[in-house]
C-alpha cells in the first residue's frame, strides 16, 4: 500500500501493523487516514509528545508487548476519535496524569500486564465514555477513593492479579452500570459491608483466590442481577445465614477451596436459577435435611474432597433437576436408602474414594436415568440383589478397588456383571479380596465353587440382564461432569484466567485440574 511505512504492513489502506524488534520508535509517516494502528513486539521504550498527531481518524490503537516504560502526558493528543486503546503487556510503572485527556470517544482501555504501582482519580477523570477498563496483572496495592467516580458508563472492570489487600467501601459506589467486576488473585482478607451496594446491574463478581475469611451478611444484598459469583480458593470458614438471600438471578456459585465446616439449611436461597454449585475442597462433615431445598434448578452439585461422613436422608430434597452429583473423596461409611430418592433426573453420581461398606438395596430406586455410577475405592464386599436392575440407561459403572468377598453370596452380582461387562470399562476390573485363595482374581471370571468348595451354589441369575445400549452416549450434554473426567474447577468464563491444564490421574482423582481456581 502506498503510504504504509516500510517497517509495517497494511492489510487494508487504513489498517497499519508494525511489529519486530528492529522498531525502536513509532514509525513515520503514518497514513493520514489510518483507522487502526498496532505496534506489537517492538523495542520501543517510550512514547514522546504527539507521535500520532497527524492520524486524527484513528479508532483503534494497540501498543502491546513492547519495552514501553515511559509515556509523555501528551502522547495521545489529537486522538479524539479513538475508541479502543491497549497498552497491555508493557513495562509501565507510572501513568502520567492527563495521559487520557481529550480521548472523549474512548470506550475500552487495556492497561493489563504492566507494572503499575498506583492509580489516581485524576487518571480516568476525563474518560466519561469508558465502558471497559482492564487493570489486571499489575502491582496495585490499593485503589484510592474516587479513582472510578467519573466512569459512570463503565460495564467491565478487571482488577484481578494485583496486590490489593483491602478495598474501600466507597470505591465502586458510582458504577451503577457495571456488569462485570473482577478482583480475583489479590490479597483481600475482608470486604467491607456496602462495597458492592451501588452495583445494581452487576452480573459477574469474581473474588476467587484471595484470602477472604469472613463475608458480611448483607454484602450482596443489592446485587439482584448477579448471575455468576466466584468465591473459590479463599479462607471462608462460615457463611452468614442471609449472605445469599437476595440473589434471584444467580446461576453459578463457586465456593470450592475454602474452609467451610458446615452448611446450614436455608443458606442457599432462594436461588431459583442456580445451575451450578461448587463446594469441593472444604471441610464439610455432614449435610443436614433440606440444605439445598431452595435450589430447584440446580444441575451440578460438587461436594467432593470434603470430610462428609453423614448425609441426612432429606439432604437433597428439592433437587429435582440435578444431573451431576459428586460426593467422591469423603468419609462416607453408610448411606440411607432414601438419600437419593428425590433426584429423579440424576445422570451421574460419583461416590468413589469413600469408606462405604454396604449400600441399601433401594439406594438408586427412584433414579432411573442414571448413566454413570462411580463406586471404586470403597470398602464394599458385596452389593444387594437387583440394585442396578432398573437402570436401563446405565453405561458406566466403576467398582474396582473394593474388597470384594468372593464367597457364594457374590454369585448374583458376578452373574450380572458378566452380562453387563461393557459398563465396567476396560481400564480396571473389580477383583476379589477374600477368601485368600482367590485374592486378586477378577470378580467377573471367578469360579465361586472353587473359591468356596464346601458350599453348593445354584446358578440362579438373580440379577436379570439389563440391556446394554452401545449407542447411548455416556454424557449427552456438554455441561456433564462425569467423575472419571470430573472438573475440579468450573471453567470460569472469562479469558484472564491461566490456561486450563488437563491432568488425567484417574487413580487418585480422575479429574480435570484447572489452575484457575
Amino acid at each position: 500500500y502506498h503510504g504504509c511505512p516500510s517497517e509495517c504492513t497494511c492489510s487494508r489502506a487504513s489498517q497499519v501493523e508494525c511489529t519486530g524488534a528492529r522498531i525502536v520508535a513509532v514509525p513515520t509517516p503514518l497514513p493520514w487516514n489510518a483507522m487502526s494502528l498496532q505496534i506489537l513486539n517492538t523495542h520501543i521504550t517510550e512514547l514522546n509528545e504527539s507521535p500520532f498527531l497527524n492520524i486524527s481518524a484513528l479508532i483503534a490503537l494497540r501498543i502491546e508487548k513492547n519495552e514501553l516504560s515511559r509515556i509523555t502526558p501528551g502522547a495521545f493528543r489529537n486522538l479524539g476519535s479513538l475508541r479502543y486503546l491497549s497498552l497491555a503487556n508493557n513495562k509501565l510503572q507510572v501513568l502520567p496524569i492527563g495521559l487520557f485527556q481529550g480521548l472523549d470517544s474512548l470506550e475500552s482501555l487495556l492497561l493489563s500486564s504492566n507494572q503499575l504501582l498506583q492509580i489516581q482519580p485524576a487518571h480516568f477523570s476525563q474518560c466519561s465514555n469508558l465502558k471497559e477498563l482492564q487493570l489486571h496483572g499489575n502491582h496495585l496495592e490499593y485503589i484510592p477513593d474516587g479513582a472510578f467516580d467519573h466512569l459512570v458508563g463503565l460495564t467491565k472492570l478487571n482488577l484481578g492479579k494485583n496486590s490489593l489487600t483491602h478495598i474501600s467501601p466507597r470505591v465502586f459506589q458510582h458504577l451503577g452500570n457495571l456488569q462485570v467486576l473482577r478482583l480475583y488473585e489479590n490479597r483481600l482478607t475482608d470486604i467491607p459491608m456496602g462495597t458492592f451496594d451501588g452495583l445494581v446491574n452487576l452480573q459477574e463478581l469474581a473474588l476467587q483466590q484471595n484470602q477472604i475469611g469472613l463475608l458480611s451478611p448483607g454484602l450482596f444484598h443489592n446485587n439482584h442481577n448477579l448471575q455468576r459469583l466466584y468465591l473459590s480458593n479463599n479462607h471462608i470458614s462460615q457463611l452468614p445465614p442471609s449472605v445469599f438471600m437476595q440473589l434471584p438471578q444467580l446461576n453459578r456459585l463457586t465456593l470450592f477451596g475454602n474452609s467451610l465446616k458446615e452448611l446450614s439449611p436455608g443458606i442457599f436461597g432462594p436461588m431459583p436459577n442456580l445451575r451450578e454449585l461448587w463446594l469441593y475442597d472444604n471441610h464439610i462433615s455432614s449435610l443436614p435435611d433440606n440444605v439445598f431445598s431452595n435450589l430447584r434448578q440446580l444441575q451440578v452439585l460438587i461436594l467432593s474432597r470434603n470430610q462428609i461422613s453423614f448425609i441426612s436422608p432429606g439432604a437433597f430434597n428439592g433437587l429435582t433437576e440435578l444431573r451431576e452429583l459428586s460426593l467422591h473423596t469423603n468419609a462416607l461409611q453408610d448411606l440411607d436408602g432414601n438419600v437419593f430418592r428425590m433426584l429423579a433426573n440424576l445422570q451421574n453420581i460419583s461416590l468413589q474414594n469413600n469408606r462405604l461398606r454396604q449400600l441399601p438395596g433401594n439406594i438408586f430406586a427412584n433414579v432411573n436415568g442414571l448413566m454413570a455410577i462411580q463406586l471404586q475405592n470403597n470398602q464394599l464386599e458385596n452389593l444387594p440383589l437387583g440394585i442396578f436392575d432398573h437402570l436401563g440407561k446405565l453405561c458406566e459403572l466403576r467398582l474396582y478397588d473394593n474388597p470384594w468377598r468372593c464367597d457364594s453370596d457374590i454369585l448374583p452380582l458376578r452373574n450380572w456383571l458378566l452380562l453387563n461387562q461393557p459398563r465396567l470399562g476396560t481400564d480396571t476390573v473389580p477383583v476379589c479380596f477374600s477368601p485368600a485363595n482367590v485374592r486378586g482374581q477378577s470378580l467377573i471370571i471367578i469360579n465361586v465353587n472353587v473359591a468356596v468348595p464346601s458350599v453348593h451354589v445354584p446358578e440362579v441369575p438373580s440379577y436379570p440382564e439389563t440391556p446394554w445400549y452401545p449407542d447411548t452416549p455416556s454424557y449427552p450434554d456438554t455441561t456433564s461432569v462425569s467423575s472419571t473426567t470430573e472438573l475440579t474447577s468450573p471453567v470460569e468464563d472469562y479469558t484472564d484466567l491461566t490456561t486450563i491444564q488437563v491432568t488425567d490421574d484417574r487413580s487418585v482423582w480422575g479429574m480435570t485440574q484447572a489452575q484457575s481456581g
Epitope: 487494508r12 487504513s14 489498517q15 501493523e17 483507522m35 487502526s36 479508532i59 494497540r62 467491565k156
Partner: antibody, heavy 120, light 110 residues
Amino acid sequence: QVQLVQSGAEVKKPGSSVKVSCKASGGTFSSYTISWVRQAPGQGLEWMGGIIPMFGTANYAQKFQGRVTITADESTSTAYMELSSLRSEDTAVYYCARGVALLATDFDYWGQGTLVTVSS
Amino acid sequence: QSALTQPASVSGSPGQSITISCTGTSSDVGGYNYVSWYQQHPGKAPKLMIYEVSNRPSGVSNRFSGSKSGNTASLTISGLQAEDEADYYCQSWTHDNSVVFGGGTKLTVL
C-alpha cells in the same frame, strides 16, 4: 484458513430471545472484528453490529440498539449475538462475518448462516 | 443509517459488460474510500468481490472492477458469464464507525 462455524437453526416465539454462536478457527480471534449481518427472506443484507473480542465492547447499528447484545469469549474463540423481544420480522438468516484487519471495513470471511424463525 | 441505493435489477447477455451503481451520502460512500461489493448466490453466504472501492481479493476474476465518484460507487462486470448471475450488494463504512449495505441488485444473465 479462517473458518466461521455457526450454531444451528432456531424456532422462537414472539417476545422471546435467541442467542446465536459463531466459532472461529484458523487464525487469531481476539484482534479481528466479528460482525453480525442478517438477511430476511427475499431481502437484502443488514448490518447489526460488531465486536473486537480483545476490547470487549461492541458497536451496534442504531436500529438494533438496546435489543441486540454481541459478546465474545476469547477462551473458546466464539462470538455470540443475542437478540431479544423477538417479533415475526426478525425471521431471517443471521451471519457472522470477519475482516482481515483489526477494524472490519469489509468482510472476507462469512459463517454458513443460522436461520432464526419467529413464529407463534 | 439508511441503506445505500442500488437498482433492484440489471441484466445483460453473455460477453457484455454491465454496471451496478450504489448511491450514498457524504457520511458514507462519499466520505470514505471504504466501499466493498459482495456477490451472493441463492442459499449461500455472500462473497467479497471488491474492497476499498477498487481492490480485488485474491481469487476474484479481473472481470470485476470497482470505482467511485462523489457519493456514488460502481461495480462493473465485463465479459458477462452465466455464473455471474447472482445478487450483488455494495457496502460502505460510515461516519459513526458502523457499516451500511445497499438494498441489493439482482443480476440476470440473459
